[in-house]
């Protein structure tokens, strides 16, 4: 059957250095395995940007951090039964 997702470990607030690489993690359980999407300030994060890598294990990696990467990032874990969200604020300086 289908079971609503639960985020076991979500992203954490952090301050990161400009030009560095930082990650946002989102470990979720559910049935079937939840789909993970990321939004920044409400807008879907595009992995078309070569700086942004969707790694395994629900990890979003952002290379060459820019001041414009500052914002609230939300992990959305979804299954047919529903969705769960977890947000964190990232400041690039």
């Amino acid at each position: 059957g289908s079971m609503g997702p639960v985020i076991r470990q979500g992203p954490v607030n952090q301050t990161v250095a400009v030009d560095g690489t930082f990650v946002l993690s989102c470990v979720a359980t559910g049935s079937p395995v939840p789909t993970i999407l990321w939004r920044k300030d409400g807008v879907l994060v595009s992995t078309q940007d070569s700086r942004i890598k969707q790694l395994e294990n629900g990890v979003l990696q952002i290379r060459y951090a820019k001041l414009g990467d500052t914002g609230r990032y939300t992990c959305i874990a979804s299954t047919p039964s529903g969705e769960a969200t977890w947000s964190a604020y990232i400041e690039v300086q």
């Epitope: 030009d19 990650v23 700086r51 890598k53 790694l55 990890v59 060459y64």
Partner: antibody
């Protein structure tokens, strides 16, 4: 193929510019890195640069002293090193960042290295 | 910064044996770990990426495993050609720190 040049002996406070000539692949589509191996055999990433040269990263140990750049028309990667210290003594390698799925950072081609000695 | 602790610093084994090198991270690196092999007088070579994925041209005698903070590299049926120093590298967040290396020798 990656071939580094420009190493040598330099006094503390001095400068040196390393070059890395690339061939055999489409240089302009790859991010590149500089890694050094210190006399005690430790490895340290000292610079990364993206494919178009618009973004760079340096660890705190070299930030403000080292600058990486590239000339995609000539297929050459550079590392300008200034205010050199004795702890910068190392073998310097240029390396190509692999295009992998999943997209983990890994270096799949390395040059033969060029030696830099900072000594008075 | 994420610290990488590699052990042992050196080991000696006989041809045909299986050896394991371990690498510990100071925090969870979610499988973002790379292994390199550096033979004497040569440049490093990519061996394993993403903790478990074997680089294209490498022997299947090499295998990577682990998750969270603990990772290992196993070399099965040791060959004389495996004499080298092996390094792990954190590739989750910068600085992308390397372990201090494990020097493998043949008895």
């Amino acid at each position: 193929q990656l071939v580094e040049s420009g190493g040598g002996v330099v006094q503390p406070g001095g400068s040196l510019k390393l070059s890395c000539a690339a061939s055999g692949f489409t240089f302009s589509t790859y991010d590149m890195s500089w890694v050094r191996q210190t006399p005690d055999k430790r490895l340290e990433l000292v610079a990364t640069i993206n494919s178009n040269g618009g973004s760079t990263y340096y660890p705190d140990s070299v930030k403000g002293r080292f600058t990486s750049s590239r000339d995609n028309a000539k297929n050459i990667l550079y590392l300008q090193m200034s205010s050199l210290k004795s702890e910068d003594t190392a073998m310097y390698y240029c390396a190509r960042e692999a295009l992998l799925r999943p997209a983990y950072y890994a270096l799949d081609y390395w040059g033969q290295g060029t030696s830099v000695t900072v000594s008075s | 910064d994420i610290q990488m602790t590699q052990s042992p610093a050196s080991l000696s084994a006989s041809v045909g044996e299986t050896v394991t090198i371990t690498c510990g991270a100071s925090e969870n690196i979610y499988g973002a770990l790379t292994w390199y092999q550096r033979k004497q007088g040569k440049s490093p070579q990519l061996l394993i990426y993403g903790a478990i994925n074997l680089a294209d041209d490498k022997s299947s005698r090499f295998s990577g495993s682990g998750s969270g903070r603990q990772y290992s590299l196993k070399i099965s049926s040791l060959h004389p050609d495996d004499v080298a120093t092996y390094y792990c590298q954190n590739v989750l967040s910068t600085p992308f720190t390397f372990g201090s290396g494990t020097k493998l020798e043949i008895k």
